[in-house]
Interface confidence: low
Amino acid sequence: QIDLNITCRFAGVFHVEKNGRYSISRTEAADLCKAFNSTLPTMAQMEKALSIGFETCRYGFIEGHVVIPRIHPNSICAANNTGVYILTSNTSQYDTYCFNASAPPEEDCTSVTDLPNAFDGPITITIVNRDGTRYVQKGEYRTNPEDIYPSNPTDDDV
């Protein structure tokens, strides 16, 4: 069973958290975004999302970096920094950010109901939207499924 908590999309960029903890590798992040018909965002795409109101308090993969987008300073989020804060001391597992090029150019908070590009598989995947709505499907999104249950998930605090 996998729970994927996802946010609203801001200029196509959104945050995905798996099973309530940092548990996504960079390889899995790319696979997961692909399953959402998305890609890992570029820094420019993340900065655009930030400019229209996107912020989180979770480290996640983008293309080439692990970041937290911050608008308001908060001592427990990105060490009080604002902007797209880049983590320098990387470990292996975080959340991920994804970019959907067909999303509206502004903020889109309608519920995501499925993983459109997932393929057949036995795993129960639950998509949890920010408004609490949950959608369940069976499937798989990994190209490297042996890594589905990481033997050593990190549970870092931000």
């Epitope: 729970d3 908590n5 609203c8 801001f10 958290e17 309530g20 229209i52 109101g53 996107f54 912020e55 989180t56 308090c57 608008i71 908060n74 427990i76 989020c77 509206p104 502004e106 903020e107 889109d108 908070c109 309608t110 519920s111 109901t113 949890v128 920010r130 408004d131 609490g132 709505t133 949950r134």
Partner: antibody, heavy 117, light 108 residues
């Protein structure tokens, strides 16, 4: 600016139905789910359900399942909440709300529904 | 259903004082999907905090939220006259979405 404007107060008899409207402006209506929440006098806020304004999908609180229907008219940027089989304990202020966005969480001004024989 | 219990029910304080409001959940709130609202008589609730600790647009920095799992706190660092109101917590990590019973912050 973003605004949700609700229809006016209603007085209904027990067993009747009421339909409250919520007109949205200042943003793309179909980009956000719309929720309905009620507040009986002196009581806590109570979530009733939501509609995905993009595709029309709805989700209702089990407490109201079968009595509440939430719909939308995208051409009018308006959401509707209809509650049937009214009883006196349904007397409350009913709010529409656009939840959880980085740009804030606008609510309608509220619609007082009084159920009285 | 996640039940949210707020305490205290009423908080009597003077302007300039610090207010600490508590919200306890009957089970863990998914991904800290917890919000705080302020409500004044005759008005709709106003979002203060979402995601347990993120301030909504236009909310003064004297309001701050913290916590995770089952225990959450709203802190108002220095009460202004306009802050005297009822405050509600709400979880939106699982359906049905639920609200706490509220804490009334009144002038001492």
């Amino acid at each position: 600016q973003v605004q949700l404007v609700q229809s006016g107060a209603e007085v209904k008899k027990p067993g009747a139905s009421v339909k409250v409207s919520c007109k949205a402006s200042g943003y793309t209506f179909t980009n956000y789910a719309m929720h309905w929440v009620r507040q009986a006098p002196g009581q806590r806020l109570e979530w009733m359900g939501w509609i995905n304004t993009g595709n029309g999908n709805t989700k209702y609180s089990q407490k109201f399942q079968g009595r509440v229907t939430i719909t939308r008219d995208t051409s009018a940027s308006t959401a509707y909440m209809e509650l049937s089989s009214l009883r006196s304990e349904d007397t409350a202020v009913y709010y529409c709300a656009r939840f959880y966005s980085g740009s804030g969480s606008p609510w309608g001004q509220g619609t007082l529904v009084t159920v009285s024989s | 259903e996640i039940v949210l219990t707020q305490s205290p029910g009423t908080l009597s304080l003077s302007p300039g004082e610090r207010a600490t409001l508590s919200c306890r959940a009957s089970q863990s709130v998914s991904s800290s999907y917890l919000a705080w609202y302020q409500q004044k008589p005759g008005q709709a609730p106003r979002l203060l905090i979402y995601g347990a600790s993120s301030r909504a647009t236009g909310i003064p920095d004297r309001f701050s939220g913290s916590g995770s799992g089952t225990d959450f706190t709203l802190t108002i660092s220095r009460l202004e006259p306009e802050d005297f109101a009822v405050y509600y917590c709400q979880q939106y990590g699982s359906s049905p979405l639920t609200f706490g019973g509220g804490t009334k912050v009144e002038i001492k």
